[in-house]
Amino acid sequence: ADLGSMGYFELQLSALRNVNGELLSGACCDGDGRTTRAGGCGRDECDTYVRVCLKEYQAKVTPTGPCSYGYGATPVLGGNSFYLPPAGAAGDRARARSRTGGHQDPGLVVIPFQFAWPRSFTLIVEAWDWDNDTTPDEELLIERVSHAGMINPEDRWKSLHFSGHVAHLELQIRVRCDENYYSATCNKFCRPRNDFFGHYTCDQYGNKACMDGWMGKECKEAVCKQGCNLLHGGCTVPGECRCSYGWQGKFCDECVPYPGCVHGSCVEPWHCDCETNWGGLLCDKDLNYCGSHHPCVNGGTCINAEPDQYLCACPDGYLGKNCERAEHACASNPCANGGSCHEVPSGFECHCPSGWNGPTCALDIDEEFGLVPRGSGHHHHHH
């Protein structure tokens, strides 16, 4: 299955010394039957390659059985003894190359794993003699060494030295999490992204770090305009404040009143809560007509009645809706200088004799200087 890997176990062989050029069985690598005890193996050097087996931690290592964590091998690295460049930058480059299918450092074995790294492990390293004519079998084994221990994912290499029965091996190991995997077990996934499924980078521990303008566990929620009332508004993209139905304003903190609401406001959408002295569904009925219009004249007292309605209580001698009419207006003989008084709906009218004018016939008509008060007159005046 194309699962990808969560991490890599890396082994870099630094040196192998097989001074006598012999196999673990005591035979010579060239297979001529001689042993070191019968004069050494001088004719032909071993063609040494390494096989690596990685498995679960075993207090007592058993060299047989499946390599449950993975397996790897090198090509032929050299003869009886050889030295390879130490692990480091070269190893890192080789690992990158091996992952992209490029040429790999021959002494580097990379074993990918697709499970949470358990930290404890058993490593079995075998040196073998390559023989074109035969398949690998125990007869070609040069050396087998093992190590059981613990290792945490990190960039630093850990050195191991083994002195076996016939050969000495020096190698370095490390575990590294794959790109996008984090934690001591390499099973925490975080791949930076900037799309609808999340807007985040990853910190050194593999936690999602939301980009500016985004929040939430997966960084999918937009951060709205500062001050936006999130009870009545929100946003799908950063910096906006889009109001819910019934709310308005830059911060969605103003309710929309009932349409046509005149002298009112709202606390809840579609309400029309009237201002003082206003009533009706649209707050357009004046409950204090007296206070806002002062309709009563001639000392009349205004009394608020139904919305938009009022009554005037008129003083003695006045009547009409607004106390605008005088009752028996001529009874007080208001017309001077012989003017005759006539009651009309608005009060009284004086009909002035010739030479007099004004509301009560008190103004003399002088041909030169205009109107001046005098004792007798000619004109009449309507009031």
Epitope: G4, F189, N194, T201, A222, V237
Partner: antibody
Framework: EVQLVESGGGLVQPGGSLRLSCAAS????????IHWVRQAPGKGLEWVGG????????DYANSVKGRFTISADTSKNTAYLQMNSLRAEDTAVYYC????????????????WGQGTLVTVSS | DIQMTQSPSSLSASVGDRVTITCRAS??????VAWYQQKPGKAPKLLIY???FLYSGVPSRFSGSGSGTDFTLTISSLQPEDFATYYC?????????FGQGTKVEIK
Amino acid sequence: EVQLVESGGGLVQPGGSLRLSCAASGFTFTSYDIHWVRQAPGKGLEWVGGISPADGDTDYANSVKGRFTISADTSKNTAYLQMNSLRAEDTAVYYCARNDYDVRSVGSGMDYWGQGTLVTVSS
Amino acid sequence: DIQMTQSPSSLSASVGDRVTITCRASQDVSTAVAWYQQKPGKAPKLLIYSASFLYSGVPSRFSGSGSGTDFTLTISSLQPEDFATYYCQQSYTTPPTFGQGTKVEIK
């Protein structure tokens, strides 16, 4: 070669259930999202939901939230769409698609699609 | 949800014509817009991602532009195999939404 193959479509009665499968191959399953997109007969494309197989993160369209569930089995390289309480308006061809993304650019693209599987909800 | 409005809904053109399809987002979606081509009975194919990046294997006669709310897909010289329906899609915020499609027909 990257391949996505849907299966599990068919005729189902309103209120019934169906499980669609999307078998993936040719790529690292855990490195991409898998999304479900549907297309009603003669209509346009509608996103249904998606999953990130590596961490199990899912998201859904409002129209299917609470009724549909997306899951993934990384050992089988397969994503699933469990559809419950099906309605006539869920009738469509259902596609699974791989969504690729790169933090260096805003947005993403569904670069590989399956052939689609028809789901018909009718009594 | 962000609405993606494509125009025109259909167009007739001849081989060799320059064709432009526009897509307008109801809100700012940065450059997170992809374009797809779909032929009858087939799955959609990705043409453009992140507004202007040509997907691998797509002919260079296809190009995309735009940012914010206004986006354009251009086919510089229409070929017989380009007669299909084209969809824009915003991938900036969840849920990702598609335009209603533009059908390009032979004149």
